[in-house]
Structure formats: C-alpha cells, structure tokens
Amino acid sequence: SVGQYNCPGQYTFSMPSDSHVSSCSEDWVGYQRKCYFISTVKRSWTSAQNACSEHGATLAVIDSEKDMNFLKRYAGREEHWVGLKKEPGHPWKWSNGKEFNNWFNVTGSDKCVFLKNTEVSSMECEKNLYWICNKPYK
C-alpha cells in the first residue's frame, strides 16, 4: 500500500518505491518524477489552486492511469480537488493550461473535478474540499 488512511484529511505516508527523498521538499511525496502535496484542510477549488501556486505547483495534473491510481489510494474516502476544470463552451482544461484529452470519464455535471478512492467526479467549485497539488521534480 502507498499510504495509510487515518482519519479524514490526515494521512501517514509510506514512500513509493521510485521516490527520491531529496527531490521533494518536506510534506511533499514523490512519485513518477512528480512531487505531490495533500492538504489537511478544506478550501474552494480556486482557493486550493492559489494555495498550490504559492508553492510553485498547480492542483494535480494527472497524466496516466498509474498516477490516477496512486492519487485515488492517497485520497481514500475523502473528496480532493484536482486540477481539471470546465468552463462554459470550452474544452476541459488542466490547471497548467493543457487541454484534457478525455482519457478518463468525469461523472457529475459541474465545473470542477475531485477524486476519491472510488471515483472521479465534479462538484460546484465553491464547495470546500481537501486538495492535491503537484509539480515536477526539480
């Protein structure tokens, strides 16, 4: 298992096998050449994105099934914002500006995307959820 679930928003991390301890700062976890931060408090999607930006990161951009499964395991039963958003008439976009190529399905009918261990869905962006940031290894 990649991490243990303790209580909502609180996690005990065990380092994934490809982690390089020196590559990610304290409180960040390394996986697949990215550093991840998982919040212990809740914010709106925009506020969470701003929090990630303060650390030179974005809300999590998910590039592969491997990354997705990793994040779902870490998220556990709690809903966590990730960096995918839909604006009216526009294609889905990641928080780094890249267009989403629909490699997974988003359930729900709202603008901002969250994940937990069982699903990737959408919710009103103003709702306060935990969140996940990521950035490339330095």
Partner: antibody, heavy 119, light 107 residues
Framework: QVQLVESGGGLVQPGGSLRLSCAAS????????MSWVRQAPGKGLEWVSV????????HYADSVKGRFTISRDNSKNTLYLQMNSLRAEDTAVYYC????????????WGQGTLVTVSS | DIVLTQSPATLSLSPGERATLSCRAS??????LAWYQQKPGQAPRLLIY???IRATGVPARFSGSGSGTDFTLTISSLEPEDFATYYC?????????FGQGTKVEIK
C-alpha cells in the same frame, strides 16, 4: 428582471459584415459567461461562441472560427458578435444567452435578431 | 463533435397524457445534458440541466433522467402550454451541441 435584447440583424450580401449587439439588464452582467446561439429558418439550434465574464477567454464553433469575433463591454452591459465574410449558410436568427452563474448551462435567452445573407 | 439524436421527431399526444422524449449521444456526455423548450417565434427556455435538475420556475411535471449516452425527458401529464419543440444539449465536450429536436403536437 433579466432582459437580453439583440439588435443589428438585417440583410447583407455574401462576403459582407455585420455587428450584432446584445444589451443586458436586470443582472450583474460582468459576473456571467455569455454566448451566441443561432437557428437557421425551420432548423435546430447551433452554438456559435462563448466569452468569459471578463472577456479574456473566448471559444468558437469551427463553422465560424476566423470569421466571427465575440466581445463584450462590461461598462455598457453589452455583448457583441462581429461577423465577417458572411455566407448564405450563416442566415439564421441569432440569440444571445446567459450562462447560469457558476454553472455550464444557458438559463436565459434573448428574443433573437434575424441575419439574412443573400445577394 | 458529439452528435445528439432525438427521437421521435414528432410526438402526437393529447393533453393529460404522458410524454417521453429520448436523446442519445454518439459518445458519453456523463450527466452534462440540458433540455430546452421552444415555442414558435420564441427563444428557447431552459427546463432541465445536469440531466435531472429542474431550472427555476419549471413545473414538477417535467423530469429528466439518464447518464452516459441515453437520456429521457418526461412530461408526466401534458398541459396545453407544453405543446412545443424540445431540444437536448450536451456541455461535456467542446463544442456544445444540440439535438435536432422533438416536436410535441396536439393529437
């Protein structure tokens, strides 16, 4: 109450230009995404373009890309559609529509303005 | 682009009857689907969004269901003012697209 009033439609020759306006009232215009949707005579609805509340982000249907430009003036509570290089197939009633705040769906539409492209 | 196919093209019913309108998407649109009502010479009116959420002021006789590729608009008991054309619209994929419409006419 919410009101959207389109104007600027009329008869224009193929290759010509037209600028449509949509005057908004009864809500805080600058807080809403706005869109243009058209309907050819006796046909269904076709989404044309969208603009973000601040005017920075726009998106277009492939059928009008490079020919139409959506814009807005929040100080005048007005939405615009500049239509260039008009074709016969652009003949339609053009509606402006407001998106529900913080959502993805068009909850209020104007009554439309007819654009006829013909020689 | 995602193609929405509505059926039937025309539905002939009497006031008080139940109307069931179908909308099928060429690929999944999750629950990002809306229904609009349009009467001749008028602008479209939003009825349902997010597959099943009634817009403000829409009577309870209108309901929406479905997900993925198959969606239904149900009018439980037709009122005289419900005879109109109904369009489905998806907002999952860009560009947004509409179905070709279903006309509900008086039998």
């Amino acid at each position: 109450q919410v009101q959207l009033v389109e104007s600027g439609g009329g008869l224009v020759q193929p290759g010509g230009s037209l600028r449509l306006s949509c005057a908004a009232s009864g809500f805080t215009f600058s807080n809403y995404y706005m869109s243009w949707v058209r309907q050819a005579p006796g046909k269904g609805l076709e989404w044309v373009s969208v603009i973000s509340y601040d005017g920075i982000s726009t998106h277009y249907a492939d059928s009008v890309k490079g020919r139409f430009t959506i814009s807005r003036d929040n100080s005048k509570n007005t939405l615009y559609l500049q239509m260039n290089s008009l074709r016969a197939e652009d003949t339609a009633v053009y509606y402006c529509a407001r998106y529900i705040g913080n959502s993805l769906y068009m909850d209020f539409w104007g009554q439309g303005t007819l654009v006829t492209v013909s020689s | 682009d995602i193609v929405l196919t509505q059926s039937p093209a025309t539905l002939s019913l009497s006031p008080g009857e139940r109307a069931t309108l179908s909308c099928r998407a060429s690929q999944s649109v999750s629950s990002y689907l809306a229904w609009y009502q349009q009467k001749p010479g008028q602008a479209p009116r939003l009825l349902i969004y997010g597959t099943s959420i009634r817009a403000t002021g829409v009577p309870a006789r209108f309901s929406g269901s479905g997900s993925g590729t198959d969606f239904t608009l149900t009018i439980s008991s037709l009122e005289p003012e419900d005879f109109a054309t109904y369009y489905c619209q998806q907002e999952y994929s860009s560009p947004p697209t509409f179905g070709q419409g279903t006309k509900v006419e008086i039998k």
